[in-house]
Interface confidence: low
Amino acid sequence: PKQTLPKPIIRAESTYMVPKEKQATLCCQGSYGAVEYQLHFEGSLFAVERPKPPERINGVKFHIPDMNSRKAGRYSCIYRVGELWSERSDLLDLVVTEMYDTPTLSVHPGPEVTSGEKVTFYCRLDTATSMFLLLKEGRSRDVQRSYGKVQAEFPMGPVTTAHRGSYRCFGSYNNYAWSFPSEPVKLLVTGDIENTSLAPTDPTFPDSWDTCLLTRETGLQKDLALWDHTAQN
């Protein structure tokens, strides 16, 4: 069997949801000594980065300027050490946002409910779309989908205090082209026992864990600080 290196990890810096015309940054974390990293888009070669010095860098950043719907889709990366190529990374879905209209998000029976109550979010968007997405801030990978023409429902069922937090919705023109985000709606769920004066902590939106964490070898120790490698060809 043909020998391959372990697959790299591909991540989006800051977020995989990139406003149109803004720059997207994807990180490919491979291995020290990798001489070349390739970014693939929808199965085809999209960009190449060659770190210098390769033995002291375990990944690269790919900057994708002027985000638009043609650049939104599925990305993956591979790397090479000598003549040996790695397996392909997992796929990363890069989404362009701020396309066309802005939806309106509402919640019923209201933003303040008691644990156990049934709650439904409604996302309304004027522009033609068939899919709507509801995201809880800080959990942007946990996307709920619903279908409708101008408005979609997101029944949450009986809620618990775990549902507390801020929500936004998007209309999706295709899997990778989303509308502007709605204004956030904060859901407050009061419990029977716990201290309800403690407001839930809302992680910043988008997720903090989407950050690229590339490491640089400095002798025996690795510098775990964020490090922006601008590749030179």
Epitope: E98, Y100, D101, T102, T104, R124, D126, T127, A128, K149, V150, Y173, F180, P181, S182, E183
Partner: antibody
């Protein structure tokens, strides 16, 4: 009831700018996008662009991009359309229209005449 | 952009008769097609949304049909106040586009 009331007729010189207002009432202004459609004398309807008052997101017809600016003031429920570098062919009736999927409510129209 | 083509440009029909107006999109717009009526000196008025959905306050004699690229507005029995210009509109994708209009005149 929903009402869109536009500012009055304007006469402008070529090369100048015009700003037309559209005051909305009878509904929650931020819940619908507001668009501008124009109609030259004896001609059909032409979409210029729209705005989401929610956060100011805009979409423009490329034909007008760079010349048209659409804004909205949530505090007064008023949308504005400014068209710059006016030329004689911009002589038209300009309508604001609320969009709820379709253009379900329209302003009465503002006549803009461009003449030297 | 999606080009909307209406036919005929002018339609002459007698009051009490049936009028059929056509609209064709240059590519499929599903049922995201809206119809408007405009009388001289007035703003357009929404008649039908999403190809066939009726609008509150619009007489039942106005109906719409079609999906994809071909659409029809039917006025079952023309009243004198129905003589006007009718426009179809692509509501599917930006830029939003209108047909050039069909003028419905008294025969």
């Amino acid at each position: 009831q929903v009402q869109l009331v536009q500012s009055g007729a304007e006469v402008k010189k070529p090369g100048s700018s015009v700003k037309v207002s559209c005051k909305a009432s009878g509904y929650t202004f931020s819940e619908y996008t507001m668009h501008w459609v124009r109609q030259a004398p004896g001609q059909g309807l032409e979409w210029m662009g729209g705005i989401s008052p929610n956060i100011g997101g805009t979409s423009y017809n490329q034909k007008f991009k760079g010349r048209v600016t659409i804004t909205a003031d949530k505090s007064t429920s008023t949308a504005y359309m400014e068209l710059s570098s006016l030329r004689s062919e911009d002589t038209a009736v300009y309508y604001c229209a609320r969009r709820g999927g379709s253009f379900d409510y329209w302003g009465q129209g503002t006549t803009v005449t461009v003449s030297s | 952009e999606i080009v909307m083509t209406q036919s005929p440009a002018t339609l002459s029909v007698s009051p009490g008769e049936r009028a059929t107006l056509s609209c064709r999109a240059s590519q499929s717009i599903s049922d995201y097609l809206h119809w408007y009526q405009q009388k001289p000196g007035q703003a357009p008025r929404l008649l039908i949304k999403y190809a066939s959905q009726s609008i509150s306050g619009i007489p039942a004699r106005f109906s719409g049909s079609g999906s994809g690229t071909d659409f029809t507005l039917t006025i079952s029995s023309l009243e004198p106040e129905d003589f006007a210009v009718y426009y179809c509109q692509n509501g599917h994708s930006f830029p939003l586009t209108f047909g050039q209009g069909t003028k419905l005149e008294i025969k």
